[in-house]
């Protein structure tokens, strides 16, 4: 599980970079954000690290009343403070490591972070 | 009603060190970011550090980086500016100022106080 | 860095005249553009954010426009009290927080 757990750490650090070159990635990491209530991979100033990124902006799925533009020159209070890696991978644990062995095709590789069929059920839960 | 007093300017040796303070009234300081922002004699606006809400995030202007430390003290309500190795071009009215962020503008600005660096 | 531009870095005008000073960034900003009056031996005082919104307690003669790298401040009908020093100040990226040179309004 500590195994699984720094895959998807690395995983999602290495997405984040990807952010502002590959509008499938950002989409992806956008809705995981947004679903989980989680900015960056330990928290939003990992953001800031992202060399494209200006450093007084967030993803706007990182807000907590996400709007058009709510990233940009942001407040700490209008945006969700934890990490996404704690969070998502606490799910994780709970909801799919228990029910299934997830391969590291299911957590990583180029594009998929956690698969689609994950993330949908997360949503509706 | 909403206020921001700053304290500890006045006169200086180059290479000397000052503390400015900034206190705050009226308002939930942890809402808001805070700046300092100085003006020479005769001169326009300048930004010279910020910081978050928390003070997790800081961020200073090329011009001081290295020589000035921003802090804050949210149960005080209480803003600071450590200023070491002080230089002439130092010499400024020094505001403090709230900041909401987002497009709203800096809309709360201190009096000033007035740091003069000199032999 | 973005750059800002005032001009006219001065100007002189009469009461009642219409003025209008403009602000120049150096790349797109969309509307994250506010403007202060400064008047001497006081500290300044925020006007318009986010490009064209009057802030609170501000007369409606003073009105902001623009988006992207152009903006402009207009005060519609000068009186005695506007006569002062106005910046244009950038918060789309920042470190820094960057403001214009400034432009001074005098009585003609």
């Known amino acids: 599980r500590d195994k699984v757990m720094s895959e998807f750490n690395n995983n999602f650090r290495q997405q984040m970079e990807n952010y502002p070159k590959n509008n499938h990635t950002a989409s992806i990491l956008d809705r995981m954000q947004a679903d989980f209530k989680c900015c960056g991979a330990a928290n939003y100033t990992d953001w800031e690290k992202i060399p494209s990124m200006s450093k007084n902006r967030v993803p706007d799925s990182c807000c907590i009343n996400v709007t058009v533009g709510c990233g940009i020159n942001f407040n700490e209070k209008a945006i969700h403070k934890e990490g996404c890696v704690e969070k998502i991978g606490g799910w994780l644990r709970k909801n799919v490591l228990e029910q299934k062995l997830i391969s590291e095709e299911d957590l990583g590789g180029e594009q998929k972070l956690i698969s689609e069929e994950d993330l949908h059920h997360h949503h509706h839960h | 009603q909403v206020q921001l007093v700053e304290s500890g300017g006045g006169l200086v040796k180059p290479r000397g060190s000052l503390r400015l303070s900034c206190a705050a009234s009226g308002f939930i300081f942890d809402d808001y970011f805070m700046n300092w922002i100085r003006q020479a004699p005769g001169k326009g606006l300048e930004w010279v550090s910020y910081i978050s809400n928390s003070g997790n995030t800081k961020y200073y202007a090329d011009s001081v980086k290295g020589r000035f430390t921003i802090s804050r003290d949210n149960a005080y309500n209480s803003l600071y500016l450590q200023m070491n190795s002080l230089r002439a071009e130092d010499t400024a009215v020094y505001y403090c100022?709230?900041?909401?962020?987002?497009?709203?503008?800096?809309?709360?600005w201190g009096q000033g106080t007035t740091v003069t660096v000199s032999s | 860095d973005i750059q800002m531009t005032q001009s006219p870095s001065s100007l002189s005008a009469s009461v009642g005249d219409r003025v209008t000073i403009t602000c120049r960034a150096s790349?797109?900003?969309?509307?994250?553009l506010n403007w202060y009056q400064q008047k001497p031996g006081k500290a300044p005082k925020l006007l318009i954010y986010?490009?064209?919104s009057l802030q609170s307690g501000v007369p409606s003669r003073f009105s902001g426009s623009g988006s992207g790298t152009d903006f402009t401040l207009t005060i519609s009908s000068l009186q005695p009290e506007d006569f002062a020093t106005y910046y244009c100040?950038?918060?789309?990226?920042?470190?820094?927080?960057?403001f214009g040179q400034g432009t001074r309004l005098e009585i003609k």
């Open positions: 100022v709230r900041d909401p962020r987002s497009y709203y503008g800096m809309d709360v």
């Open positions: 986010a490009a064209s």
């Open positions: 100040q950038q918060s789309y990226s920042t470190p820094p927080i960057t």
């Open positions: 790349q797109s900003i969309s509307s994250y």
